[in-house]
């Protein structure tokens, strides 16, 4: 909006706020079991991990902040099967970490986010 | 889990990860108009603002990470009414900023998050 109507400093603060809300990778807490699609018989300790996921606002309401590039981070977690038949096992779980984001008009066809090795 | 089975360093890394995923106030991007429940005739620039909101994991699946204390932050935004009858107005919008969080069994009764002055 025209700077003639408003104090330049105020406009600068508003613009900085907008920049910070833009679609970008943000640190997010994800629940491993639900992402893995595991049954309620299997759970993890800790149940959640921190990764970067795309989030934030787009210039158009119809656009969605989606990942354009992904790396996979290996997290060491305890996998526990109920009833307990053995000692909880320390397993590597690969979790999707979004490294690039873009405001896109439609969601990708295969939103897979976790790979177990 | 018993440290005898696993390397102390590995357990330390896992514990640090778990601490970081715990229910706490996290910087979040919120869409102002949808939070305000405004009609499509009224919109804001920027449409989103950054505030702290409760998020993260709880020790039990039945618990939800909820706010226990809230402060209200005033954000300067342009309020635009369509059809445009005047110059977009710079208005203070009070947005809920969660300052305390707790894992609770139920949602609070009044989840109001934005107040217009």
């Amino acid at each position: 909006f025209a700077a003639t109507f408003y104090d330049i400093e105020t406009l600068k603060v508003i613009d900085e706020e907008w920049q910070r809300t833009q679609c970008s990778p943000r640190e997010t807490c994800v629940e491993v079991a639900s992402e893995l699609g595991k049954s309620t018989n299997t759970f993890f300790k800790p149940p959640c991990v921190n990764v970067f996921r795309c989030g934030g606002c787009c210039n158009e309401e119809s656009l969605i902040c989606m990942n354009t590039s992904t790396s996979y981070i290996s997290k060491q977690l305890f996998e526990i099967s109920v009833p307990l038949t053995s000692v909880p096992e320390l397993v590597p779980v690969k979790v999707a970490n979004h490294t690039g984001c873009k405001c896109l008009p439609t969601a990708p066809r295969h939103p897979y986010s976790i790979i177990r090795r | 889990f018993a440290a005898t089975f696993y390397d102390i360093e590995t357990l330390k890394v896992i514990d640090e990860e778990w601490q970081r995923t715990q229910c706490s106030p996290r910087e979040t991007c919120v869409e102002v108009a949808s939070e305000l429940g405004k009609s499509t005739n009224t919109f804001f620039k920027p449409p989103c603002v950054n505030v702290f909101r409760c998020g993260g994991c709880c020790n039990e699946e039945s618990l939800i990470c909820m706010n226990t204390s809230t402060s209200y932050i005033s954000k300067q935004l342009f309020e635009i009414s369509v059809p445009l009858t005047s110059v977009p107005e710079l208005v203070p919008v009070k947005v809920a900023n969660h300052t305390g969080c707790k894992c609770l069994p139920t949602a609070p009764r009044h989840p109001y998050s934005i107040i217009r002055r």
Epitope: D15, W18, Q22, E60, E61 | T40, K45
Partner: antibody
Framework: QVQLVQSGAEVKQPGASVKVSCKAS????????MYWVRQAPGQGLGWMGY????????TYNQKFKGRVTMTTDTSTSTAYMELRSLRSDDTAVYYC???????????WGRGTLVTVAS | DIVMTQTPLSSPVTLGQPASISCRSS???????????LHWLQQRPGQPPRLLIY???NRFSGVPDRFSGSGAGTDFTLKISRVEAEDVGVYYC?????????FGQGTKLEIK
């Protein structure tokens, strides 16, 4: 008030390239996507694509993929649309249009006539 | 691509009388967020297009209240309650729910 001022008319030979500019004023340039639309003489409107001036992200109509490039210069609040390998059927008026948060193209440039003829 | 079909292609109207333009899309324009991104544009002779209605029924800045939009899903209508001389031109519907954004072929409004 919001204004989009486009560059002047161009005459090009087939196979050449054209770069049309669109200078924006009266609003925060990086806060709105810029669309490019063309209109052949006596015809309807055709969407070419858009650019997000905040980060330079582009989305193109597949019809023009490989031939069109949209860019912005945020220091001058100017959007550019370059079309390569011009053909006679690219003869059209090329418009830039700002898009509101709700998706409507709310402000338009006056258009740039590009004529492709040998 | 979403095909937008307008009817009629030409509409001769008497001044002061109502006019109606229909627009049908080949697929639903309801976005996954619940909104419908169907817009109407007016293009007067020798002028660039101008936004009249956005998101089905919201009149844009400076647009007279004789213009109104309605519809849902795949069927939409632009109505002019009383046609004035300045309303002469071509009217386009456009959608921004899907990519590529597409336009109707246009409806020419002329005075009888």
């Amino acid at each position: 008030q919001v204004q989009l001022v486009q560059s002047g008319a161009e005459v090009k030979q087939p196979g050449a390239s054209v770069k049309v500019s669109c200078k924006a004023s009266g609003y925060t340039f990086t806060g709105y996507n810029m669309y490019w639309v063309r209109q052949a003489p006596g015809q309807g409107l055709g969407w070419m694509g858009y650019i997000d001036p905040y980060n330079g992200d582009t989305t193109y109509n597949q019809k023009f993929k490989g031939r069109v490039t949209m860019t912005t210069d945020t220091s001058t609040s100017t959007a550019y649309m370059e079309l390569r390998s011009l053909r006679s059927d690219d003869t059209a008026v090329y418009y830039c249009a700002r898009t509101s948060y709700y998706g409507g193209m709310d402000y338009w440039g006056r258009g740039t006539l590009v004529t492709v003829a040998s | 691509d979403i095909v937008m079909t307008q009817t009629p292609l030409s509409s001769p109207v008497t001044l002061g009388q109502p006019a109606s333009i229909s627009c049908r899309s080949s697929q639903s324009l309801v976005h996954s967020n619940g909104n419908t991104y169907l817009h109407w544009l007016q293009q007067r002779p020798g002028q660039p297009p101008r936004l009249l209605i956005y998101k089905v029924s919201n009149r844009f800045s400076g647009v007279p209240d004789r213009f109104s939009g309605s519809g849902a899903g795949t069927d939409f209508t632009l109505k002019i309650s009383r046609v004035e001389a300045e309303d002469v031109g071509v009217y386009y519907c456009s959608q921004s729910t899907h990519v590529p954004r597409t336009f109707g072929q246009g409806t020419k409004l002329e005075i009888k």
